[in-house]
Interface confidence: medium
């Protein structure tokens, strides 16, 4: 399917591809001796980046700070130093910059100040970092400002006192709409949720909260749920933890009208030292992580039905440390229903699944071709990959990365990885997958930063090295083949490969330092690999490519979720800019039901490799209990039940039947005795 | 076959530094996590934390946090444990130990140094 | 973190007898528990793994049960060369803990 990986051998050379990207490698030294630099992009396609650069020296009493801002409005390639535009102030790092969702161009840096002020101060920009305006808080803010997703101009923010303050002009005014405020979210539609402790605080009070909601801004509120341990939103769905009436177990609750009516949620009940955790949601379900008791480091992931209410098993032993909060659960938004994660094994070693059918099976990662098995396989012959994620970030194995996909790199897949029977602590490779995650590649020896540019016409990677560093590799055929170019004479300690979100981008920063006797230096190289891909992509350079594809003789073959989809894909040979306005080109087509496009219903699991569900042992033969919309009902069930956003018509269709019993619903949580709605005079 | 070998005996004065090397071989150095346990005398052992020789990167228990550096060099396969602000009861043998070649969430030792007896004294 | 506790502290026994020791966790380990022999002056040697799994080359004499809190290591017929200290050793979740230790000694 593809040769193995090769650097400058084998591979036809790009014409004068050094002249071409040295007349296009733009440097920028930055003039200070900042200890930490973090960058921000302003905007989409804007070429508008934001640079701020600190200076902290902890002095015996206060610590004396620096900051310097610095913008960019062509993709890196030049900066203006706009530290004036901040009145020369001291920018609170832990708060980073707040950039406006969308395009909205603005911009909120918080400022440090002085022990005894009655507030907080900001500084505003609504013109893509023009122009700042200085504006002094009445609190002191305790996070970073969140802006309403539907209206940039409605802020809200946390002060240390624990008060909620809401502003409806970007910033200028702020008005405080309620005390003792523990968390809060901006909602759709500009609703605002909340909890607030009753009695003493909110770490007092975990599990004796109140849930709040505004939908006017702080005007009027409406009490929707009582004894909340915490709350979360995930595509459309709220959810809350509650305590249950009897002991200190909580269980979760979910809504999906803004919390005017709540179902219980069949999914096991945890103890004080255990978690819920939403790995991932959409508009159609669910990914819930539900601990083990005991500090053992895994638990178990459920996958909800459309309601968000009934939950099936999907995998069991998932790595979720306690300790660091650290899962692998990882979508790779480059193929439709694919995630990747890892599993503690009964050796107490770490092995990698992906899943395809967005939880319906997982499986073990196919083993690169040509691969050997490394220490960690029994039999040298038979293994799997198995890739490095954030745990193995968190354990410092030699792991820059977490893996990388694009959603308009169609298929797209690069991660660092190893291959025996667990993730080895071996130095890692770098593997890539062009469809999904299917089959695997090694692209790259050794440990890389990378990134995708113009839509995956362009991989860009770095060798992650503690030595100072001046070569950057990049690939035009998806990681087959690499060129090496020389960026700088004076090598750099490199601290991170910079390019504009959405992978659109032709343009790369290389950002780090240099280090002489007594000063470090930052400095950045843009590159543009325009030059490089030098015509425009047209129709005979992309192919047709259906997706999931793994059996080309059969009929259902790419079927998932109940359709299949043909792709438009650039051919890796073809040399030419997808450009920035590239939509990705996909033609779906409906497939007929079958009993892959149903999950196990609540009480059934699917063995591993098989088609069927069978019931749970134990929850033979018992009726199954759910509570739906404060009601009390009994659910019978032959074991399947579609998987949300699944399209398939016709075919094999096991149906369902739901018995309401309409009893009341043994959670009290929402008694309507306790539900109340006042206004905020 | 797979072999640690431990530097000789230490006496150290209160508040000096010890450090303690462990050579490996037999095996892949860069492909097991190096891990310290000492023992004082007439004690049980008491698991000090871990290296990983192929980053760098280290996870040391609470306990000695602050005062404990684990480093290695790959170029001779040795890991090295560096402890600080000595204290008499800091006295004990020091035992160097393979991991496996997992990455696991813990793990146990089938391979130990012969350990390094280090005195504190005044 | 985890707390091992181990009885009996100190064990009389003779050659050819049936040797039993007992360790405890202070939470559920499932099985990730190790035992380990320790002679004067030397470093500790791995007798099982994951609370039964027996170590290549530890002679079948030596067996290990147990799961969640309770585990134990057994000796069928206890040999000359099996006056020893053991210890167990969770390897559950960091920081890794070792039980205070069981020696056995001639009757």
């Known amino acids: 399917r593809r040769g193995a990986p090769a650097e400058d051998q084998d591979c036809g050379r790009l014409p004068d591809f050094i002249a071409k990207l040295t007349n296009n490698t733009h440097q920028h030294v930055f003039d200070d001796l900042s200890g930490s630099v973090s960058l921000s992009w302003v905007g989409d396609s804007t070429g508008v980046i934001l640079v701020l650069t600190t200076f902290q020296v902890p002095l015996v009493i206060v610590s004396f700070g620096q900051s310097k801002l610095y913008r960019s409005e062509d993709y890196g390639k030049n900066f203006k130093d706009i530290t004036n535009l901040i009145n020369n102030t001291f920018i609170r790092t832990e708060f980073g910059m707040a950039i406006g969702p969308e395009n909205s161009g603005k911009v909120i840096l918080t400022a440090e100040v002085s022990g005894g002020s009655r507030g907080g101060r900001v500084f505003r920009s609504s013109d893509f970092a023009k122009n700042f305006v200085q504006t002094d808080l009445p609190f002191h803010p305790l996070t970073q400002m969140m802006y309403s997703p539907q209206n940039s101009d409605y802020l809200l923010a946390l002060s240390t006192e624990n008060g909620l303050w809401v502003s409806k002009n970007f910033g200028e005014k702020w008005e405080e709409i309620h005390k003792a405020v523990c968390l809060a979210k901006w909602g759709p539609n500009n609703i605002i949720f909340f909890t607030t402790h009753v009695n003493g605080s909110c770490k007092a009070d975990l599990g004796a909260l109140e849930l709040w909601r505004t939908s006017d801004l702080g005007k009027t509120f409406k009490t929707i749920g009582v004894k909340i341990y915490s709350f979360g939103l995930g595509g459309r769905f709220l959810f809350a933890s509650v305590m249950a009436d009897k002991d200190t177990t909580r269980r979760i609750h979910v809504s999906t009208d803004q919390g005017d009516t709540w179902s219980m949620a069949q999914l096991p009940s945890v103890g004080q030292e255990q978690f819920y955790s939403i790995l991932a949601a959409n508009e159609d379900m669910v990914f819930m992580h539900v601990d083990e008791p005991g500090d053992t480091g895994f638990g178990t992931i459920f996958t909800s039905d459309d309601r968000g209410i009934v939950y099936s098993k999907s995998l069991d032993r998932h790595l979720y440390t306690t300790t660091g909060g650290e899962t692998d659960f990882t979508n790779v938004t480059s193929l439709r229903g694919v995630y990747i994660t890892s599993t503690l094994s009964e050796d107490n070693s770490i092995q990698s699944m992906i899943t395809f059918d967005q939880g319906g099976r997982w499986e073990h990662l196919r083993k690169p071709e040509n691969s050997k098995c490394d220490a960690t396989a029994k039999n040298k012959n038979e293994c799997s990959l198995h890739i490095h994620a954030s745990y193995s970030i968190s354990q410092k194995l030699n792991v820059p990365m977490a893996p990388l996909s694009e959603p308009n790199a169609v298929g797209i897949v690069i991660a660092h990885g190893s291959v025996g029977d667990a993730i080895s602590v071996m130095v890692p490779d770098v593997y890539i997958s062009d469809d999904g995650g299917y089959s695997w590649a090694k692209m790259l020896e050794g440990p890389h930063y990378y990134t995708i540019l113009d839509s995956g016409g362009i991989i860009v990677a770095i060798e992650h090295s503690n030595r100072p560093i001046n070569v950057i590799k990049f690939s035009t055929d998806e990681g087959q083949c690499w060129q090496s170019y020389v960026f700088t004479q004076e090598p750099i300690y490199f601290t991170g490969l910079a390019s504009e979100p959405g992978a659109r981008s032709m343009n790369i920063s290389i950002w780090g330092f240099t280090e002489s006797f007594i000063t470090r230096q930052w400095v950045s190289y843009t590159v543009d690999f325009k030059d490089i891909l030098e015509r425009n992509c047209e129709e005979d350079d992309y192919t047709t490519w259906l997706a999931h594809s793994t059996d080309p003789g059969d009929y259902k073959d790419g079927c998932i979720l109940g359709y299949k989809e043909q792709f438009l894909r650039l051919r890796k040979s073809s040399v030419c800019q997808n450009g920035r306005d590239y939509v990705v080109a996909k033609q779906p087509s409906v497939c007929p039901c079958s009993l892959e496009d149903f999950l196990c219903d609540f009480g059934y699991f699917r063995p591993e490799n098989a088609s069927e569900c069978v019931e749970q042992p134990e929850l033979k033969g018992h009726e199954l209990e759910f509570c739906l919309y404060g009601k009390e009902e009994h659910l019978t069930t032959n074991g399947y039940r579609k998987i949300p956003g699944d399209k398939c018509q016709g075919g094999m269709n096991p149906a369902r039947e739901v018995k309401d019993l309409k009893k009341k619903c043994t959670s009290n949580f929402l008694n309507p005795t306790k539900q109340n709605s006042k206004s905020n005079s | 076959q797979v072999q640690l070998v431990q530097s000789g005996a230490e006496v150290k004065k209160p508040g000096a530094s010890v450090k303690v090397s462990c050579k490996a071989s037999?095996?892949?150095?860069?492909?097991?996590?190096m891990h310290w346990v000492r023992q004082a005398p007439g004690q049980g052992l008491e698991w000090m934390g871990w290296i990983n020789p192929n980053s760098g990167g280290t996870n040391y228990a609470q306990k000695f946090q602050g005062r404990v550096t684990m480093t290695r060099d790959t170029s001779i396969s040795t890991a090295y444990m560096e402890l600080s602000r000595l204290r008499s009861d800091d006295t004990a043998v020091y035992y160097c130990?393979?991991?496996?070649?997992?990455?696991?969430?813990?793990?146990?030792?089938?391979?130990w140094g012969q350990g390094t007896l280090v005195t504190v004294s005044s | 973190d985890i707390q091992m506790t181990q009885s009996p502290s100190t064990l009389s026994a003779s050659v050819g007898d049936r040797v039993t020791i007992t360790c405890r966790a202070s939470?559920?380990?499932?099985?990730?528990l190790a035992w380990y022999q320790q002679k004067p002056g030397k470093a500790p040697k791995l007798l099982i793994y994951?609370?039964?799994s027996l170590e290549s080359g530890v002679p079948s004499r030596f067996s290990g049960s147990g799961s969640g809190t309770e585990f134990t290591l057994t000796i069928s017929s206890l040999q000359p060369d099996d006056f020893a200290t053991y210890y167990c050793q969770q390897y559950k979740s960091y920081p890794i803990t070792f039980g205070g230790g069981t020696k056995v000694e001639i009757k």
């Open positions: 037999g095996y892949t150095f860069t492909g097991y996590y």
């Open positions: 130990a393979r991991g496996g070649p997992q990455l696991r969430v813990a793990e146990y030792f089938q391979h």
């Open positions: 994951k609370a039964s």
């Open positions: 939470q559920s380990i499932s099985s990730w």
